[in-house]
């Protein structure tokens, strides 16, 4: 089990590092987006795992951004985010495979309404229970 957890961490960290770099290979990214969305978590250790991903980064002082799958919809009344988060999530759930371009990548400020827990604990718990 420890080996499995290590392998999972390595895969996730690699997925985060390479997020958005290859529009033809988005299966791992979309799977991880789905995990974050479902487990209500962000990043592996912490949301800050995402801050090195250049494609998500804002300019200057607004650098810290995370994927929209980290957005905590229940913590906000902001309906505009529904179009950006919920609909893409639903299309992925329906396996509507399509190549994604960097312009399609949805990011939100990490200081807003996001999940502040990393996903490691939730996934480890899930592994222990299965």
């Amino acid at each position: 089990r420890a080996q499995l957890e290590r392998s999972l961490r390595d895969v996730v960290e690699k997925t985060i590092q390479k997020y958005g770099t290859n529009p033809e290979e988005t299966a791992a990214e979309e799977s991880w987006d789905y995990v974050q969305f479902q487990l209500r978590c962000c990043g592996w250790h912490y949301p800050q795992d995402w801050f090195q991903v250049l494609i998500l980064r804002g300019n200057g002082s607004e650098a810290h951004r995370v994927p929209c799958s980290c957005y905590n919809l229940s913590a906000t009344n902001d309906s505009t985010i529904l179009d950006k988060v919920i609909l893409p999530q639903l299309s992925r759930l329906g396996h509507l495979a399509r190549s994604r371009h960097s312009a399609d990548i949805c990011a939100v400020p990490a200081e807003s309404h996001i999940y502040r827990e990393g996903c490691a604990q939730g996934l480890q718990k899930w592994l222990h229970n299965n």
């Epitope: 912490y46 800050q48 795992d49 801050f51 090195q52 980064r57 002082s61 650098a63 810290h64 905590n72 913590a75 906000t76 400020p109 990490a110 200081e111 807003s112 309404h113 996001i114 502040r116």
Partner: antibody, heavy 115, light 107 residues
Amino acid sequence: QVQVKESGPGLVAPSQSLSITCTVSGFSLTTSGVSWVRQPPGKGLEWLGVIWGDGSTNYHSALKSRLSIKKDHSKSQVFLKLNSLQTDDTATYYCAKGGYSLAHWGQGTLVTVSA
Amino acid sequence: DIQMTQSPASLSVSVGETVTITCRASENIRSNLAWYQQKQGKSPQLLVNVATNLADGVPSRFSGSGSGTQYSLKINSLQSEDFGTYYCQHYWGTTWTFGGGTKLEIK
């Protein structure tokens, strides 16, 4: 443009509580974090805590038991409360826009803890 | 909590010189690091975040580098307005800390 301004009591007696208000403009408290930092006279910076856009907080682990940060969106204000003050809590207290890196700082308010 | 160790504590340099200030974290902070400049009697100002990303309006003579536990701030061709105290700050985990500061004085 972004503005951040602290207002505090100046002098507080030992064992009493400190309350400081940070009034902000030029950005929304729903999408930005606001942090608190203090600096004792002639010393370095000490991070105290942050309140995020969703109202959740992170606190300095050694101060967690006597520190609280809250906010009022309608007034664009963030509040710091520090209980059971001692003389070593004497410092300039700053609030700043930003939860991770702190992009805009207030001018600070000097708080002296003395009988 | 993660400790941040800055060095040197102070240095005396001339205008036009290049200086490097370093910051060591007690554990891997994965580039979640900011640098600030503070002048006497003033509030700190953000220079760099995410270890290498220059904040808005910061001159290009400033640059940040590093990864893991070791980070540095380099100032090329020092100007008179660059003198003051510099602080690093990490934001990995759930509680942040500042380094002890580096006082940059005019020679």
